[in-house]
Amino acid sequence: MAVTACQGLGFVVSLIGIAGIIAATCMDQWSTQDLYNNPVTAVFNYQGLWRSCVRESSGFTECRGYFTLLGLPAMLQAVRALMIVGIVLGAIGLLVSIFALKCIRIGSMEDSAKANMTLTSGIMFIVSGLCAIAGVSVFANMLVTNFWMSTANMYTGMGGMVQTVQTRYTFGAALFVGWVAGGLTLIGGVMMCIACRGLAPEETNYKAVSYHASGHSVAYKPGGFKASTGFGSNTKNKKIYDGGARTEDEVQSYPSKHDYV
């Protein structure tokens, strides 16, 4: 039961996280004009990964896309790439994790396959979250650098007569959305990986034929190992107390402690 809950919660947390990463990537407020001592401004500038906007106090808002690709800073391109990779990995992870969910029955999919898929989606969520956190952090670092540079040149005088106020930019809402979303995706991924351990069956049995020894009613079958998940090995000996040879497929399967749906 705990495994199903962990897996389900991991899926939901990752889903929220990836939705947040998508929202952050699309948001226009990655950087917003620093208002320092002036909370009311006649012209308010803010920028996203894809366009920059200006909101006047009149209520008029104008946004302009970055129609150039080569003219954009390499750092901005890198942030875009990280966020897109994060979204793509997260989306694939969600798709995989849907089929891996314990509460969803797809044909006769074995627990080992579900465990594999859970681990795969978990790793994808972790990488997706890390991409988002990295992207947002790179952008934040870029902002901090530019902020202090523009503070140093806050006013560029022309003969001491004319002053040009340089617009400084600070952290926008999208950065916080991105950090939180990335963190949630990361946590969801870790939860999926934890759920994977519990999902893996106690032993993965190979289709082995059991022959009973002539003198004893004991059949020896080599214990399988959890090669697919990589979590330890299981070398228990199983006794089959009926005579005759049977394939593993014919052996009655009883619910394990993890088989609650």
């Epitope: 006649a42 500038n45 920028q47 200006v54 006047e56 009149s58 209520g59 040009t164």
Partner: antibody, heavy 118, light 113 residues
Framework: EVQLVQSGAEVKKPGASVKVSCKAS????????MHWVRQAPGQRLEWMGM????????NYNEKFKGRVTLTLDKSASTAYMELSSLRSEDTAVYYC???????????WGQGTTVTVSS | DIVLTQSPDSLAVSLGERATISCKSS????????????LTWYQQKPGQPPKLLIY???TRESGVPDRFSGSGSGTDFTLTISSLQAEDVAVYYC?????????FGQGTKLEIK
């Protein structure tokens, strides 16, 4: 047709207060900032402050802070400007004006003359 | 506060001639975000409130005759009346629409020569 109709002329004594009204019609009152600008005889136009009829938020020129109060009556689509502790230099024509694109004033009231005299 | 200085204080131009009014700002009115200059021009006739002519330094308000044009960027701006008409006699003001408090130039009185 957009119209801003202001109250009539006022004569006040120094130290008194004056309250000027500005009734808006012909547009959605709550959608535009209402600004107040004054013009003393032979002087340049002077921005006093603004109020948003929807949120009621205000912003004042530091020069008038503490003396000017902008209020609203949303149901009557009317904005008010009250100036206290009047001095002779407050003798001016007071205008209400609607803010539009470009942070410019596209419609103005006809003006209210306030005379401060002992 | 941004200080706007207009020149000349008064101007006499013959009918049909070009009139040019200058407005200088103590700070740049160019917004880097949209590359627009937040300077507005108004016309005020005696006993009337100001009338909006031009915003964003060069965008003509609807209904304003095309003989009125605005130009300039940063700190230096110009209002031009290409062919002066009798009804253009008025005082012209420039306004900083970029930062609060909004400020106005001292005005330029335009007369017919």
């Amino acid at each position: 047709e957009v119209q801003l109709v202001q109250s009539g002329a006022e004569v006040k004594k120094p130290g008194a207060s004056v309250k000027v009204s500005c009734k808006a019609s012909g547009y959605t009152f709550t959608s535009y900032w209402m600004h107040w600008v004054r013009q003393a005889p032979g002087q340049r136009l002077e921005w006093m402050g603004m109020i948003h009829p929807n949120s009621g938020s205000t912003n004042y020129n530091e020069k008038f802070k503490g003396r000017v109060t902008l209020t609203l009556d949303k149901s009557a689509s009317t904005a008010y400007m009250e100036l206290s502790s009047l001095r002779s230099e407050d003798t001016a024509v007071y205008y209400c004006a609607r803010l539009k694109t470009g942070n410019s004033f596209d419609y103005w009231g006809q003006g209210t003359t306030v005379t401060v005299s002992s | 506060d941004i200080v706007l200085t207009q020149s000349p204080d008064s101007l006499a131009v013959s009918l049909g001639e070009r009139a040019t009014i200058s407005c200088k700002s103590s700070q740049s009115l160019l917004n880097s975000g949209n590359q627009k200059n937040y300077l507005t021009w108004y016309q005020q006739k005696p006993g009337q409130p100001p009338k909006l002519l031009i915003y964003w330094a060069s965008t003509r308000e609807s209904g304003v005759p095309d003989r009125f044009s605005g130009s300039g960027s940063g700190t230096d701006f110009t209002l031009t009346i290409s062919s002066l008409q009798a009804e253009d006699v008025a005082v012209y003001y420039c306004q900083n629409a970029y930062t609060y408090p909004f400020t106005f130039g001292q005005g330029t009185k335009l007369e017919i020569k």
